[in-house]
């Protein structure tokens, strides 16, 4: 025998109290698949969370973070504070990058500058707390008489992955 509940579509639940009739999910609840015996409570985006997508009868709400914070975890389960570029977030708060390291993002930790000499190149632009070193041509190419090199216009630096 076919389970009568299997006929209940997403957005409804199989109501045992009403002869297994398909009833719509109550307000602030949803069912994303058919045949469910209960509806799930909608996620509420409160505090540092803000609503990215409202809850509907067939799908949960989706949250992201208010400005100054970024998402962590599947489905943005946590909001973590941003730091400034040139800083990293330690367990004790935001801290400036040490000499020889940089961070061009508002999250993550400080990354060591590129060592141009390892690829046989020279330093064209020194690094800062916010920017990596820019490597130029190899030192041999900079001998007298070698044509000068114009650095290319900076492209977008690697950025945030969507959560």
């Amino acid at each position: 025998l076919q389970d009568p509940c299997s006929n209940c579509p997403a957005g409804t639940f199989c109501d045992n109290n009403r002869n297994q009739i398909c009833s719509p999910c109550p307000p602030n609840s949803f069912s994303s698949a058919g045949g469910q015996r209960t509806c799930d409570i909608c996620r509420q985006c409160k505090g540092v969370f803000r609503t990215r997508k409202e809850c509907s009868s067939t799908s949960n709400a989706e949250c992201d973070c208010t400005p100054g914070f970024h998402c962590l975890g599947a489905g943005c389960s946590m909001c973590e504070q941003d730091c400034k570029q040139g800083q990293e977030l330690t367990k004790k708060g935001c801290k400036d990058c040490c000499f020889g390291t940089f961070n061009d993002q508002k999250r993550g930790i400080c990354r060591p500058w590129t060592n141009c000499s390892l690829d046989g190149k020279s330093v064209l632009v020194n690094g800062t707390k916010e920017r990596d070193v820019v490597c130029g041509p190899s030192p041999a190419d900079l001998s007298p008489g070698a044509s000068s090199v114009t650095p290319p216009a900076p492209a977008r630096e690697p950025g945030h992955s969507p959560q």
């Epitope: 020889g100 993550g108 930790i109 990354r111 060591p112 060592n115 690697p158 950025g159 992955s161």
Partner: antibody, heavy 120, light 109 residues
């Protein structure tokens, strides 16, 4: 969807060089650092180095400095790892892996791996 | 020091809880990531930044980190969890930015 597809298996003689490629698709290749990690038979994972595909800036583990070169061709969304002066203990599976957009997080997408066998 | 120490193996019965440790000096000040590695497959990120799961990783996998030890916990272990697990940390040092632990083989009894 994000995909990293690596070149096929290689067999090399000691002293030779090998160049492994990693073609990226499904995202903005220039926007995310690419890392290389290897695993020798019966051994653990070992980080080798990274490249910023946007600038070409690199960093290598000290163990490999002078033998490894990581490059990229942004026009075909491909990163390369070249290892020179190969020894038998360089026999390993070599993986490319994408950093998720900032330094200090886990590597979120990996290539399928390329087996490099070094044998005389 | 840039050494992360893991036990070579951990054995657990199906349905039980497995705990895999990763030791390192003041590792609690770092952000630890965990990868699952099965034979002939690429590693899979299962926990990042101490305790966060990427999409698609089941809730029974969790992580914690304090003091000198980070821990990956797998509850209600299944046969499909049998794999090697590696912890990993990024440093700001130019010579050793990326360091992996030696790996732990999870054996399902």
């Amino acid at each position: 969807q994000v995909q990293l597809v690596q070149s096929g298996a290689e067999v090399k003689k000691p002293g030779a060089s090998v160049k492994v490629s990693c073609k990226a698709s499904g995202y903005n290749f220039s926007g995310y650092y690419m890392h290389w990690v290897r695993q020798a038979p019966g051994q653990g994972l070992e980080w080798m180095g990274w490249i910023n595909p946007n600038s070409g800036g690199t960093n290598y583990a000290q163990k490999f400095q002078g033998r490894v070169t990581i490059t990229r061709d942004t026009s075909i969304s491909t990163a390369y790892m070249e290892l020179s002066r190969l020894r038998s203990d360089d026999t390993a599976v070599y993986y490319c892996a994408r950093e998720p957009g900032y330094y200090g997080s886990g590597l979120d997408y990996w290539g399928q791996g390329t087996l490099v066998t070094v044998s005389s | 020091s840039y050494v992360l120490t893991q036990p070579p193996s951990v054995s657990v019965a199906p349905g039980e809880t497995a705990r895999i440790t990763c030791g390192g000096d003041d590792i609690g000040d770092k952000r630890v990531h965990w990868y699952q590695k099965k034979p002939d497959q690429a590693p899979v990120l299962v926990v990042y930044e101490d305790r966060y799961r990427p999409s698609g990783i089941p809730e029974r996998i969790s992580g914690s980190n304090s003091g000198n030890t980070a821990t990956l916990t797998l509850s209600r272990v299944e046969a499909g969890d049998e794999a090697d697990y590696y912890c990993q940390v990024w440093y700001s040092s130019p010579d050793h930015p990326g360091v992996f632990g030696g790996g732990t083989q999870l054996i399902i009894l």
